[in-house]
Interface confidence: medium
């Protein structure tokens, strides 16, 4: 990530190890349009935990946790021959740091568990 | 998002509608630790498409597409009584804009399809 934020070599360096971030977020009002209640309708259902931090943007980060080790079959029972596994995603958030009137921001990488999917397990047969 | 990036009211405003972003990313080396090959082992399998943009951080953004409308049963056949549905996540990327030696950055919200899960369809009964 370091080189991405550097100026071209022929240009004077950025003073103080910081750079200019324009205010405003492109596509800020874009929203996820997922099927309703997929977390409870899934064969690998999950619950959500919301974490809140006023010095982070977005302040609210939602983490999913798979409800079961197995998957739910057509009869609504847990099928223990299958596994519910988490689907993770790396995302960026902005961390706000302030000392008096001096406010600076820094990017932070966060791992988010977005939901769960049902997989056939990898079986290691005993030799 | 607008208020998050403003200074406290008692402080002088930020000149020119930009703010200071510290170089370096917190937890930059953090990596997703998902089960291996879940996209092909899932009952709602998916494929990945990689998009690349040198003026975006991260430059590589991976999008998932569900392979089937239905889900894969124990016999490896598609069961059309169930649905494979995408799991989406809002994420932030950084957009780089440069004019000569003047480089600035702006946050952009991107919708990423992270994977797929198998759900029981919502049945709308005809009145």
């Amino acid at each position: 990530g370091e080189t991405f934020f550097q100026k071209p070599e022929s240009c004077p360096p950025v003073p103080g190890g910081s750079m200019k971030l324009d205010i405003g977020i492109i596509n800020e009002n874009q929203r996820v349009s997922m099927s309703r209640n997929i977390e409870s309708r899934s064969t690998s259902p999950w619950d959500y935990t919301v974490t809140w931090d006023p010095n982070r943007y977005p302040s609210e980060v939602v983490q999913a946790q798979c409800r079961n080790l197995g998957c739910i079959n057509a009869q609504g029972k847990e099928d223990i021959s299958m596994n519910s596994v988490p689907i993770q995603q790396e995302t960026l958030v902005v961390r706000r740091k302030h000392q008096g009137c001096s406010v600076s921001f820094q990017l932070e990488k966060v791992l988010v568990t977005v939901g769960c999917t049902c997989v056939t397990p990898v079986i290691h047969h005993v030799q | 998002g607008e208020t998050f990036f403003q200074k406290p009211e008692s402080c002088p405003p930020v000149p020119g509608g930009s703010m200071k972003l510290d170089i370096g990313i917190i937890n930059e080396n953090q990596r997703v630790s998902m089960s291996r090959n879940i996209e092909s082992r899932s009952t709602s399998p998916w494929d990945y498409t990689v998009t690349w943009d040198p003026n975006r951080y991260p430059s590589e953004v991976v999008q998932a597409q569900c392979r089937n409308l239905g889900c894969i049963n124990a016999q490896g056949k598609e069961d059309i009584s169930m649905n494979s549905v995408p799991i989406q996540q809002e994420t932030l990327v950084v957009r780089r804009k440069h004019q000569g030696c003047s480089v600035s950055f702006q946050l952009e919200k991107v919708l990423v399809t992270v994977g797929c899960t198998c759900v029981t369809p919502v049945i709308h009964h005809v009145q």
Partner: nanobody, 134 residues
């Protein structure tokens, strides 16, 4: 009724060894993934080791990095008991150790997640205290 009972916790010096036992009654452990979890004072509960079910998997064991090479999880089906052999104990191993059971098989890839996310477990024991102190 279904019950898990841990035993074997004690006060031990750094570098010492202990063997914890988890005895089940009211159900057969063969069908269950068994996990050992621990909670140190003022800290969150964390998974230490787990062993897959015998009847529909391979009885393979998984460990968190901090105990790999020092702890060994095993099962004695005849006694319906799972053990945690703890060697080269460190001060930071001090905690209440719990065993827990969940019906099913565990994917090797899921083991790390499973040990982090203990809420999926069906049955829990009351715990046994391990104190490592000089």
């Amino acid at each position: 009724q279904v019950q898990l009972v841990e035993s074997g916790g004690d006060l031990v010096q750094p570098g010492g060894s202990l063997r914890l036992s988890c005895a089940a009654s009211g159900f057969t452990l063969d069908d269950y993934v068994i996990g050992w979890f621990r909670q140190a004072p003022g800290k969150e509960r964390e998974g230490v080791a787990c062993i897959s079910s015998i009847s529909n998997s391979d009885g393979r064991a998984y460990y968190v990095d901090s105990v790999k090479g020092r702890f060994t999880i095993s099962r004695d089906n005849a006694k319906n008991t799972v053990y945690l052999q703890m060697n080269s104990l460190k001060l930071e191993d001090t905690a209440v150790y719990y065993c827990a059971a969940e019906r099913g098989r565990i994917d090797p890839d899921v083991a790390g997640y499973f040990l982090r996310e203990s809420y999926v477990m069906d049955y829990w024991g009351n715990g046994t205290l391990v104190t490592v102190s000089s």
